[in-house]
Amino acid sequence: SEEPPISLDLTFHLLREVLEMARAEQLAQQAHSNRKLMEIIGK
């Protein structure tokens, strides 16, 4: 049986949210790696 439209809307909102959180975490990790690299180069 099909889900009601409201629940469909939210499931796709949640998927988008998950993707955005993953992207933000990836960027944060990249920034952290860059800082570590700069510390090593700076020494």
Epitope: E3, P4, I6, S7, D9, L10, T11, F12, H13, L14, L15, E17, V18, E20, M21
Partner: antibody
Framework: EVQLVESGGGLVQPGGSLRLSCAAS????????MSWVRQAPGKGLEWVAN????????YYVDSVKGRFTISRDNAKNSLYLQMNSLRAEDTAVYYC??????WGWGQGTLVTVSS | DIVMTHSPLSLPVTPGDPASISCRSS???????????LDWYLQKPGQSPQLLIY???NRASGVPDRFSGSGSGTDFTLKFIRVEAEDVGVYYC?????????FGQGTKLEIK
């Protein structure tokens, strides 16, 4: 660091009103759905309501529909829950949370409905 | 509304041992996108809840890899490779397939 700080709880008589607030920081508030979840003393968690980034959509559990209103002010990084016609069964700690998946939670504010 | 049911409701464990918690939903949480709309939360004593697992099997940021989520449709499991003393608290599953989102009644994990 993500921070959510609830306020506005307290003791109120049945039939009374309260407005809860949640001050958000450490993330882009206007990019996120926001939610309220409550927990009656010694009981489990109950999802109450959520609201879209631009306030164009909101959803409620049946037991609070027509009595509670979720709202937000993106300019102030704040989430609100206006609670009217309060009942004894609304007594709970109310948590605000970031997102649909409830990524982060505040410390909660206690609402006690009693005569 | 979708009803979520935990088992067991209480789980005494010995540190270092594996453990698992089950959660069953009254209807399938498998969406047409292929994702299961099931999250797991932990509420440690005296603290606010925290997200552990989202969409059935994805660990939230900072969650140790000794936790894992599995299952599909109506039957889900939260597994601990080895329980540590800091894992005590109440574990809740929540369905996010449709509003109102609903939580299970919780499983209390305690150390023997």
């Amino acid at each position: 660091e993500v921070q959510l700080v609830e306020s506005g709880g307290g003791l109120v008589q049945p039939g009374g009103s309260l407005r809860l607030s949640c001050a958000a920081s450490g993330f882009t508030f206007s990019d996120n759905w926001m939610s309220w979840v409550r927990q009656a003393p010694g009981k489990g968690l109950e999802w109450v309501a959520n609201i879209k980034q631009d306030s164009s959509e909101n959803y409620y559990v049946d037991s609070v529909k027509g009595r509670f209103t979720i709202s937000r002010d993106n300019a102030k990084n704040s989430l609100y829950l206006q609670m009217n016609s309060l009942r004894a069964e609304d007594t709970a700690v109310y948590y605000c949370s970031r997102g649909l998946a409830l990524w982060g939670w505040g410390q909660g504010t206690l609402v006690t409905v009693s005569s | 509304d979708i009803v979520m049911t935990h088992s067991p409701l209480s789980l005494p464990v010995t540190p270092g041992d594996p453990a698992s918690i089950s959660c069953r939903s009254s209807q399938s949480l498998l969406h047409s996108t292929g994702y299961n709309y099931l999250d797991w939360y932990l509420q440690k004593p005296g603290q606010s809840p925290q997200l552990l697992i989202y969409l059935g099997s994805n660990r939230a940021s900072g969650v140790p890899d000794r936790f894992s989520g599995s299952g599909s449709g109506t039957d889900f499991t939260l597994k601990f490779i080895r329980v540590e003393a800091e894992d005590v608290g109440v574990y809740y599953c929540m369905q996010a397939l449709q509003t109102p989102y609903t939580f299970g009644q919780g499983t209390k994990l305690e150390i023997k």
